[in-house]
């Protein structure tokens, strides 16, 4: 099938980084500056993305791949391919329509992005709070209250605090 197709369509022989130039008898011509083709057999090259304004270049455009952008410091990427930059907040805060606001009591955010999430409820796992939560950190759950009864000869070392799940980005 491939051989048949190439007999019918000479453009299928043009590799990535080139385009099939109709103005030159369908010769494979290199993509012009600031353009690329990531697949073979293309009749045009795509214009390279320009990382301007709040965006900065993470990866330069080449003849075979588009530029990749990220955000200037103080911002992080949102959307497919970093289509938008969202302002960072401090740990212990979340971004609202009115800007960065501190997490309400009983919630925390250990990142510069995302939302404040409730502290872990240790009692649901039959455990006690070993370290109190803050705006920036989840509580650390320790042994169950029964394990801490006066008759117990030794305290079992607490299990490591579970890594809080990342909030959906």
């Amino acid at each position: 099938f491939e051989r048949t197709r190439s007999l019918q369509d000479p453009c299928s022989n043009c590799p990535a980084g080139t385009f099939c130039d109709n103005n030159r008898n369908q010769i494979c011509s290199p993509c012009p500056p600031n353009s690329f083709s990531s697949a073979g057999g293309q009749r045009t090259c795509d214009i390279c993305r320009q990382c301007k304004g709040v965006f900065r270049t993470r990866k330069e455009c080449s003849s075979t791949s588009n530029a990749e952008c990220d955000c200037t410091p103080g911002f992080h990427c949102l959307g497919a391919g970093c289509s938008m930059c969202e302002q960072d907040c401090k740990q212990g805060q979340e971004l609202t329509k009115k800007g960065c606001k501190d997490c309400c009591f009983g919630t925390f955010n250990d990142q510069k992005r995302g939302i404040c999430r409730p502290w872990t409820n240790c009692s649901l796992d039959g455990k006690s709070v070993l370290v109190n939560g803050t705006k920036e950190r989840d509580v650390v759950c320790g042994p169950s209250p029964a394990d801490l009864s006066p008759g117990a000869s030794s305290v079992t070392p607490p299990a490591p605090a579970r890594e809080p799940g990342h909030s959906p980005q």
Epitope: K52, G53, S83, M84, C85, E86, G99
Partner: nanobody, 122 residues
Framework: QVQLQESGGGLVQPGGSLRLSCAAS????????IGWFRQAPGKEREWVSC????????YYADSVKGRFTISRDNAKNLVYLRMNSLKPEDTAVYYC???????????????WGQGTQVTVSS
């Protein structure tokens, strides 16, 4: 043609003041948040301040809080950045931008000006 144009930059001594203006042509600033960014030589672009369209709420970077004031005059289609108590580290090219959403989100299709140079030196 839609564009933003900054003006009011210049050379000023430390402790001095400047007022930058951001003028829009081809569209009305009323419906846009307007942000100011700056870029010093060899450094990354830095967010400075922003004013919302809806209620004119103002937001500032910690580095300029208490020294800079952003305001808008919708009748004149202008946004101002008043800069007091200027320091040498405020030296940069200052850009205004009109994000399509709000003060906290900036996209590829936002309008940007060409920038105005502010130099703070004795």
């Amino acid at each position: 043609q839609v564009q933003l144009q900054e003006s009011g930059g210049g050379l000023v001594q430390p402790g001095g003041s400047l007022r930058l203006s951001c003028a829009a042509s081809g569209f009305s600033l009323d419906y846009y948040a307007i942000g100011w960014f700056r870029q010093a030589p060899g450094k990354e672009r830095e967010w400075v301040s922003c004013i919302m369209s809806s209620d004119s709420s103002a937001y500032y970077a910690d580095s300029v809080k208490g020294r800079f004031t952003i305001s808008r005059d919708n009748a004149k289609n202008l946004v101002y950045l008043r800069m007091n108590s200027l320091k040498p580290e405020d030296t940069a090219v200052y850009y205004c931008t009109a994000p399509r959403s709000d003060c906290f989100h900036y996209g590829e299709n936002d309008y940007w000006g060409q920038g105005t140079q502010v130099t703070v030196s004795s």
